[in-house]
């Protein structure tokens, strides 16, 4: 019997994986090193897939190798001494200059360079740079970028306001419809802020005498109704209103006179007025009752070549006349005339002229007050400095308002450098059918009186005082205000402006940048303004948009139900 050879020679086991080989009777047994398996230890055990030791016990990456394995870490982590667990590298602590001027924030396996809102990180310069949101078309109309943010603006002068999303624009809507019906039979005397509304020339037989009859309606207390003069300017007659009463001034080769008389007729009612030249006097009648008789030695206007030539001007006079008046008068008159008969010639073609011109037509119904149609402004130059007052300048304002649209600038002070150091505006509230009153210094809102029902039949009354130290609201309302510290900063801006030149604007803003104020829409509605105890008369303005009515306000469009005519009782003028 032959001897059975050693089964371990030649070696049947996998050299890499075996630990020992044991010879048996016609067989062999390979004992494997850890990490190997199989009859010949030829198979590597994948420790990373061992269900009894998940992921080989590695916290992150398990790398299987022939007969073994090892753990490794993802980028941004380091291996702990146990060779299994990974720890996050805090790059921010390790390299403090990683983010330059930005804030380094450690995140698992990495880091982030953080910038404040409105800024973004520039990898190249390792700094935070302002995001120009305006270049990303964030706003519907106008966008102003500033460090760390942006603001959208809408063209209020074209009737737009910023929508609630603070990006898009929407039309400023009517909150109180007004009766803007006009009639061409009614001649509006205040069509022009400066200038004559109508000019007529009469050539009549020499036996003619001057006469004028008309119905007249106004709330204005002063102004020129009509002015008549001879062709050579040597004689003239002025029919005006002063202190609400009829005034007549006349001058010719024989005499020079001024007379005021009769009842006050600026009551908003139609009054029939007649001025007639008699042989020895001029007779003035109101409602067919004589109120004045002015003696005259000869004819008012001297005929020439068998003709009496007369020029008649409505609501004004030629510029050169101003210096010739016996008593100066502000010619501006907000009123209406109808049923006129001049020089006994009836309406004689005037109606045809007026019919074509919408802006010469008068409103059918008006109330006392001033009306801002949302298309222009009035400018005043007011001295707010009070020599006797230790505080220096002061602004005491009373506003009586009846808005027709819920957004617009009511009052603004504008500096010579086109900033708006003070403004009082109306803004449609976020709560439906109500408005906020906003007081601003430049483009910062310093006071907000929220959710008032201002669009109502009744007028609302608002009163406040401002000086360099304080803003005091005298109307008992809930106010949302900025911090006292911030208020002082803003009042300091106002104080600086008040030491220079400021112009006062009513009803809106002149041409200043959109971004100069939080609101830039024109005010639409009725408003009376009292500043430092003086009731502002729009006829006395430095300039005024022709559409603003100085002494007449359209009536509210009559609704069948007055359910929406509730006004905050605290705002009703108690006077």
């Amino acid at each position: 019997v032959n001897a059975i050879p050693d089964q371990c020679s030649p070696l049947p086991c996998n050299e890499d994986g075996y630990m020992s080989c044991k010879d048996g009777k016609a067989s062999f047994t390979c004992t494997c090193k850890p990490g190997w398996q199989g009859e010949k230890c030829e198979f590597d055990i994948n420790e990373c897939k061992d269900p009894s030791n998940i992921n080989g016990g590695c916290s992150q990456i398990c790398d299987n190798t022939p007969g073994s394995y090892h753990c490794s870490c993802k980028s941004g982590f380091v291996m702990l001494s146990n060779k299994k667990d990974c720890k996050d590298v805090d790059e921010c602590s390790l390299k403090p200059n990683m983010c330059g001027t930005a804030v380094c924030k450690n995140i698992p396996g990495d880091f982030e360079c953080e910038c404040p809102e409105g800024y973004r990180y520039n990898l190249k310069s390792k700094s935070c740079e302002d995001v120009d949101e305006c270049s990303e078309n964030m706003c519907a109309q106008l966008c102003v970028n500033y460090p760390g943010g942006y603001t959208c603006y809408c063209d209020g002068k074209k009737g737009f306001k910023l929508a609630q999303d603070q990006k898009s624009c929407e039309a400023v809507s009517v909150c109180l419809p007004l009766n803007l019906d006009t009639k061409y039979e009614l001649l509006y005397l205040a069509e022009q802020f400066a200038g004559v509304v109508l000019y007529l020339k009469f050539r009549l037989p020499e036996i003619s005498r001057f006469s004028a009859e008309f119905d007249f309606r106004t709330y204005d207390s002063q102004g020129v109704i009509l002015y008549a003069e001879s062709i050579d300017h040597s004689a003239w007659l002025l029919i005006a209103l002063r202190g609400g009463k009829i005034e007549v001034q006349l001058k010719n080769e024989h005499t020079s006179k001024i007379t005021t008389g009769g009842d006050i007729i600026n009551n908003g009612l139609w009054n029939m007025v007649s001025v007639e030249e008699l042989e020895h006097s001029i007779s003035i009648k109101i409602a067919k009752e004589a109120v004045m008789d002015i003696n005259k030695p000869g004819p008012l206007f001297k005929p020439e070549n068998g003709l009496l030539e007369t020029k008649v001007y409505f609501a004004g006079f030629p510029r050169k006349v101003e210096s010739e008046l016996i008593k100066p008068i502000n010619p501006r008159l907000d009123g209406c005339i109808r049923s006129w008969n001049l020089m006994k010639q009836g309406a004689s073609g005037i109606k045809e002229i007026i019919q074509e011109k919408q802006n010469k037509h008068c409103l059918v119904t008006v109330e006392k007050g001033s009306y801002y149609p949302g298309s222009g402004i009035a400018e005043f130059h007011i001295d707010y400095n009070n020599g006797s007052n230790a505080e220096g300048w002061h602004i005491n304002v009373t506003l009586n308002i009846r808005p027709s649209m819920g957004t617009g600038v009511m009052l603004a002070l504008v500096s010579s450098n086109n900033t708006v150091p003070f403004a009082v505006s109306l803004v449609d509230s976020t709560s439906e059918k109500s408005q906020d009153i906003v007081i601003s210094v430049e483009n910062t809102v310093i006071y907000r009186i929220q959710a008032l029902s201002l669009c109502s039949n009744q007028r609302s009354h608002l009163e406040f005082r401002v000086n360099r130290n304080n803003l005091e609201l005298l109307t008992p309302l809930k106010i949302e205000t900025i911090s006292q510290e911030e208020l002082q900063t803003q009042l300091a801006i106002l104080d600086k402006a008040m030491k220079g030149k400021v112009a006062t604007y009513l009803g809106g803003l002149p041409d200043v940048p959109f971004s100069a104020t939080p609101v830039n829409a024109f005010y639409n509605g009725c408003m009376e303004v009292n500043i430092n105890g003086v009731e502002l008369d729009l006829d006395e303005a430095i300039s005024k948009h022709n559409d603003i009515r100085a002494h007449s306000c359209p009536s509210v469009w009559k609704k069948t139900k007055n359910s929406e005519d509730q006004v905050d009782p605290r705002l009703i003028d108690g006077k």
Partner: antibody, heavy 117, light 106 residues
């Protein structure tokens, strides 16, 4: 006037270490906002960014090559260096250094490396 | 890493024609750069920080875009504009380039 010029060995054998130098003038790498990058471009192919060194000596690397790359600088001699270990044929390319800074961005003309056994 | 995809890969245009090429990013980027490369030359910077024209670059070149979508426009193609154009993002590391758009003269 800003100029950058790259220099290198031209030819290397696989597994050798590549040493590149970028010599520049017209600016100082110690000025805030300045930085120099290395970029390479295999012939007829696209551009690949390798590494960047900032004015404050902060360094950034392309993760896919990080273990083989070292960027450094010598501000006194106006030079930036790049070392790539264990090169192989895939590293054959034109290597550019580029200035990214406050005054604009400028690239050198490039230096060509061929890895061949 | 942010992947930049340029399209088209190749295009041709006649002199005077308006040319627009795009660069799309796999995630939002803040700063995009555009380079022009002609055979045998190193890349030349055209546009930095998305829309700023680099010094000495003709005004017919303009860049625009935001987020993940960017474009380079040549208002009127000229013969010398025939080249390969690359976009590059400078928003996060690793810095990456697009594969390029080759613009040929028709």
């Amino acid at each position: 006037q800003v100029t950058l010029k790259e220099s290198g060995p031209g030819i290397l054998q696989p597994s050798q270490t590549l040493s590149l130098t970028c010599s520049f003038s017209g600016f100082s790498l110690s000025t805030s906002g300045m930085g120099v990058s290395w970029i390479r471009q295999p012939s007829g192919k696209g551009l690949e960014w390798l590494a960047h060194i900032y004015w404050d000596d902060d360094k950034r690397y392309n993760p896919s090559l990080k273990s083989r790359l070292t960027i450094s600088r010598d501000t006194s001699s106006n030079q930036v260096f790049l070392k790539i270990t264990s090169v192989d044929t895939a590293d054959t390319a034109t290597y550019y250094c580029a200035l990214y800074g406050n005054y604009g961005d400028y690239w050198g003309q490039g230096t060509t490396l061929t890895v061949s056994s | 890493q942010i992947v930049l995809t340029q399209s088209p890969a190749i295009m041709s245009a006649s002199p005077g024609e308006k040319v627009t090429m795009t660069c799309s990013a796999s995630s939002s980027v803040s700063y995009m750069y555009w380079y022009q490369q002609k055979p045998g030359s190193s890349p030349r910077i055209l546009i930095y920080d998305t829309s700023n024209l680099a010094s000495g670059v003709p005004v017919r070149f303009s860049g625009s875009g935001s987020g993940t979508s960017y474009s380079l426009t040549i208002s009127r193609m000229e013969a010398e504009d025939a080249a390969t154009y690359y976009c590059q993002q400078w928003s996060s590391y690793p810095l990456t380039f697009g594969a390029g758009t080759k613009l040929e003269l028709k």
